[in-house]
């Protein structure tokens, strides 16, 4: 029995619902009484949801899963996962047994956008050309881990003297703090870009230092 799932990972935003698609081709005369369907976590084999003896056996996974009962007879064995969280990320296997047997695995990639970075400067007053300043770029509640890039006002990448730390909160979402140490010129703009590699979402922050006063666009 051929079981079909998407080749590419299913990308789901944290907190939203995701559909893990799985389909099979029922033969003529097929009835749901013949169907055994099992969704399980590929790695641990933990049961997620099942259908057997003509009945939906329900969710075994935090009561956040559902089948599409009206579509099962047409060969749609897809699973709806509600309110996706970081811990759901991974591979799910769809097992279908009628008279024959088949299975396939689909990957769930969880994502959450990073907030617009906030910029802080230390020290933040009485600055002169030649002073060393620390610029911190902070962005919150994203997933997966971000890529952080710094550049100056001319678009030249700044790669030296950058320290980036990422810490997961209780929900598994990351807070990113990137610190740039730089020697001031006469004036200058320093920009931080926090990129979510899955969503291809870029969040920008910048600080312009013009002697006095400073501006935070």
């Amino acid at each position: 029995l051929e079981v079909q799932v998407p080749e590419d990972p299913v990308v789901a935003l944290v907190g939203t619902d995701a559909t893990l698609c799985c389909s099979f081709s029922p033969e003529p005369g097929f009835s749901l009484a013949q169907l055994n369907l099992i969704w399980q976590l590929t790695d641990t084999k933990q049961l997620v949801h099942s259908f057997a003896e003509g009945q939906d056996q329900g969710s075994a996974y935090a009561n956040r899963t559902a089948l599409f009962p009206d579509l099962l007879a047409q060969g749609n064995a897809s699973l709806r996962l509600q309110r996706v969280r970081v811990a759901d990320e991974g591979s799910f296997t769809c097992f279908v047994s009628i008279r024959d047997f088949g299975s396939a695995a689909v990957s769930l990639q969880v994502a959450a956008p990073y907030s617009k970075p906030s910029m802080t400067l230390e020290p933040n007053k009485d600055l002169r050309p030649g002073d060393t300043v620390t610029i911190t770029c902070s962005s919150y509640r994203g997933y997966p881990e971000a890529e952080v890039f710094w550049q100056d006002g001319q678009g030249v990448p700044l790669t030296g003297n950058v320290t980036t730390s990422q810490m997961a909160n209780e929900q598994g979402l990351f807070d990113v703090h990137s610190v740039l140490r730089v020697v001031l010129g006469a004036n200058g703009t320093y920009s931080c870009l926090v990129r979510n590699p899955v969503l291809q979402q870029d969040a920008h922050g910048s600080v312009t230092i013009t002697g006095q006063p400073m501006t935070f666009p």
Epitope: L13, G15, T16, E170
Partner: antibody
């Protein structure tokens, strides 16, 4: 049942200060983002400030209040605060305390609000 | 800052009729959009989050749709208690969290 009860509103003059409190019950207060949202008379909703749950307690502010307002929380007392300094006439509004969802930043429970009037 | 524009500002509808109103975002907010209902003298109440998911206790006559920049809240058959102001809110690009200006649903 989740309950949020604001207090501390009143009438003040421009330039004065006020501290709002929000007593929370019915949920694990320390785990959740909490926010203040205000509504000027006859106007729409305006987000003011947010403090995140968990150990980080990151704070965020609307540009209109940055540098004047400070959000804080006391998890041992299940209480959210908003310290408002250098108050202006345009800060006159009903201030609502709102509980964030665990996963995203929308507000699933709101208090009844407390009125702040800034007038000379 | 993402600006949310709600239309119409006021909607006059008779009880039992269908009401549809719009929230348009100045930038893509994916599905990170919520809807609230507010009655005079009361706090807002969450209706819909993540564009389509009804909050606990919200009747199924309320439904949300859309993605990206264009979103819709539909009340399939207006009940007397549905006459209120409805606000949308985005939580994709923050701070700041932003609300739409509101749509007032009044009795025709």
């Amino acid at each position: 049942d989740v309950q949020l009860v604001e207090s501390g509103g009143g009438v003040v003059r421009p330039g004065e200060s006020l501290r709002l409190s929000c007593a929370a019950s019915g949920f694990t207060f320390s785990s959740y983002d909490m926010s203040w949202v205000r509504q000027a008379p006859g106007e729409g909703l305006e987000w003011v400030s947010l403090i995140s749950g968990g150990i980080s307690a990151n704070t965020h502010y609307a540009d209109s209040v940055k540098g004047r307002f400070t959000i804080s929380r006391d998890n041992s007392k299940n209480t959210l605060y908003l310290q408002m300094n250098s108050l202006r006439a345009e800060d006159t509004a009903v201030y609502y305390c709102a509980k964030g969802d665990l996963w995203n930043i929308f507000f699933d429970y709101w208090g009844l609000g407390t009125l702040v009037t800034v007038s000379s | 800052e993402i600006v949310l524009t709600q239309s119409p500002a006021t909607l006059s509808v008779s009880p039992g009729e269908r009401a549809t109103f719009s929230c348009r975002a100045s930038q893509n907010v994916r599905s990170y959009l919520a809807w609230y209902q507010q009655k005079p003298g009361q706090a807002p109440r969450l209706l819909i989050f993540n564009t389509v998911t009804r909050a606990t206790g919200i009747p199924d006559r309320f439904s949300g749709s859309g993605s990206g920049t264009d979103f819709t809240l539909t009340i399939s058959s207006l009940e007397p208690e549905d006459f209120a102001v409805y606000y949308c809110q985005q939580y994709y690009d923050w701070p700041p969290l932003t609300f739409g200006g509101g749509t007032k649903v009044e009795i025709k």
